[in-house]
Interface confidence: low
């Protein structure tokens, strides 16, 4: 027979030879980190047809690490569903909790004993410090000193001392996020007042008022014989300026050689009209990062060598 088979869990006792006589027997022993459980055989014999009798290393079992319980408010997930050495234990906290300690423990062989690479982590409740105070405004739950995950506060502006009110710029409600940080910056309270928009040779068709505060919206149309240069809709922005700028009504000059076109009350040229959405200074959509289970990047929760969950 040729050299006997090799196995993952057991090794040949003695050195292999290039040739074996029929009837010759070889014995195996469990490798370091594996232990023998009877009754399966760990030897084989060179058969008369020059092949080794069937043998397997099923009798040699991997050393296993001690059982780990789920952390309070979390889970201990054995990668590949096993506690055997060479594998890992992954720790995941429930929503609203974060991990203190190692996210992955490794089942390692120390001598012939399998032990975990460290102490199991714990899952702590996500807490936020009070949100920022703002000038000329206040938020709900101002007396609370510690906020829990997803706790929300809502800001409002104080009554203004003068004739013009404070406007709330930004989102009024913020919440305690999963990484102990408030979901967005606090809003601000300030007086926002835009000048009365005057359009010569045109008129206001909506948004009438004597005073124009934050987010006030006004629409215009030009008189007959005039066309709109700019946007027909403007909004009072947080800098007390109109966005887009107040439009102009310009006179329609009839072409010299052709008959002038029939005019409606307002003629808008698409090349000069800017919609509020496309305005360069218009409001930007805010990006809220996706909720994850751990600040920044975790170590690979799924784990190295983790083919099966």
């Amino acid at each position: 027979c040729e050299e006997p088979p090799t196995f993952e869990a057991m090794e040949l006792i003695g050195k292999p030879k290039p040739y074996y006589e029929i009837g010759e027997r070889v014995d195996y022993k469990c490798k370091k980190g594996y232990f023998y459980i009877p009754p399966l055989a760990t030897h084989t014999i060179c058969d008369r047809n020059h092949t080794w009798l069937p043998v397997s290393d099923d009798a040699c079992y991997r050393e296993t690490c001690p059982y780990i319980r789920d952390p309070l408010n979390g889970q201990a997930v054995p990668a590949n569903g096993t506690y055997e050495f060479g594998y890992q234990m992954h720790f995941i906290c429930n929503e609203g909790y974060y991990l203190i300690g190692e996210e992955i423990l490794y089942c390692e062989l120390k001598g012939s004993v399998a032990i975990w690479s460290g102490k199991p982590p714990i899952c702590e409740k996500v807490l936020c410090t009070p949100p920022p105070k703002i000038k000329n405004g206040k938020h709900t739950f101002s007396e609370v000193e510690v906020f829990e995950y997803l706790d929300a506060v809502t800001y409002s502006c104080d009554p203004a001392p003068g004739p013009d009110p404070f406007s709330l710029i930004g989102e009024s409600t913020i919440y305690c996020g999963d990484n102990s940080v408030w979901s967005r910056a606090a809003p601000e309270c300030k007086v926002v007042k835009c000048r009365f928009p005057v359009v010569e040779n045109g008129k206001q068709i909506s948004g009438f008022g004597k005073k124009f505060y934050y987010k006030a919206t006004v629409m215009f149309e030009c008189d007959k014989g005039f066309y709109l240069d700019g946007s027909d809709t403007i909004v009072c922005d947080s800098n007390s300026t109109w966005d887009p700028p107040v439009p102009k009504c310009l006179k329609v000059l009839p072409p010299s050689s052709t008959k002038p076109p029939a005019l409606s009350h307002s003629v808008s040229t698409s090349s000069t009209t800017k919609s509020p959405a496309s305005s360069a200074s218009g409001p930007r959509p805010t990006y809220k990062p996706p909720v994850s289970n751990y600040p920044g990047y975790p170590k690979p929760e799924e784990g190295i060598l983790d083919s099966l969950d």
């Epitope: 990047y297 975790p298 690979p300 969950d309």
Partner: antibody, heavy 116, light 107 residues
């Protein structure tokens, strides 16, 4: 044998969206975590995204976070990459890869070109 | 993020040569390292995982060694089909990162 068949690449304008698919066969798809990796023309490999076998955990590279979404349908043995707000720098060959003994099986790759 | 630095980035060799490529991690990654081979227009192919374990079906002329921050891929006798680009990759923590690659071409 293990096979990962990719589709969905093409030419797209900046700011637009595209969805890549990776159809798996020859193994129990629902037991394996999966990844997307990309390679810009003439450049090295860059890991893009990861999804756990049951879809419960996903991780992304900083360069795609908030724009790309990895997902899977275990009943259809298919992995997806939804790419929104595409940029010129997203131009690359995209590969899906199985997380077995590390990245032991790869798709054939699909080219995504972002150009106006 | 863990940076993976591969050297050299370019290597000229002849058939039968012994070739060594090194990969250095910016922080310890134990043995969580893989080596891949990529040929033009093809997907990468896994050669070595867990720093030194040969993937099934890969010729024994390929071997890997190292642990912690220093790793080596060795081709004991370069064959014509081995001319390709080689990448190392760490799987110790997210984001997963690859080395910049080593192109092995014919001298």
């Amino acid at each position: 044998q293990v096979q990962l068949q990719q589709s969905g690449g093409g030419v797209v304008q900046p700011g637009r969206s595209l969805r890549l698919s990776c159809a798996a066969s020859g193994f129990t798809f629902s037991s394996y975590a999966m990844h997307w990796v990309r390679q810009a023309p003439g450049k090295g490999l860059e890991w893009v995204a990861f999804i756990r076998s049951d879809g419960s955990k996903k991780y992304y590279a900083d360069s795609v976070k908030g724009r790309f979404t990895i997902s899977r349908d275990n009943s259809k043995n298919t992995l997806y990459l939804q790419m929104n707000s595409l940029r010129a720098e997203d131009t690359a060959v995209y590969y899906c890869a199985r997380h077995g003994n590390y990245f032991d099986s790869w798709g054939q790759g699909t080219l995504v070109t972002v150009s106006s | 993020d863990i940076q993976m630095t591969q050297s050299p980035s370019f290597l000229s060799a002849s058939v039968g040569d012994r070739v060594t490529i090194t990969c250095r991690a910016s922080q310890g990654i134990s043995s969580y390292l893989a080596w891949y081979q990529q040929k033009p227009g093809k997907a990468p192919k896994l050669l070595i995982y867990a720093a030194s374990t040969l993937q099934s079906g890969v010729p024994s002329s390929f071997s890997g060694s190292g642990s912690g921050t220093e790793f080596t891929l060795t081709i004991s006798s370069l064959q014509p089909e081995d001319f390709a680009t080689y990448y190392c990759q760490q799987l110790a923590s997210y984001p997963l990162t690859f080395g910049g690659g080593t192109k092995v071409d014919i001298k």
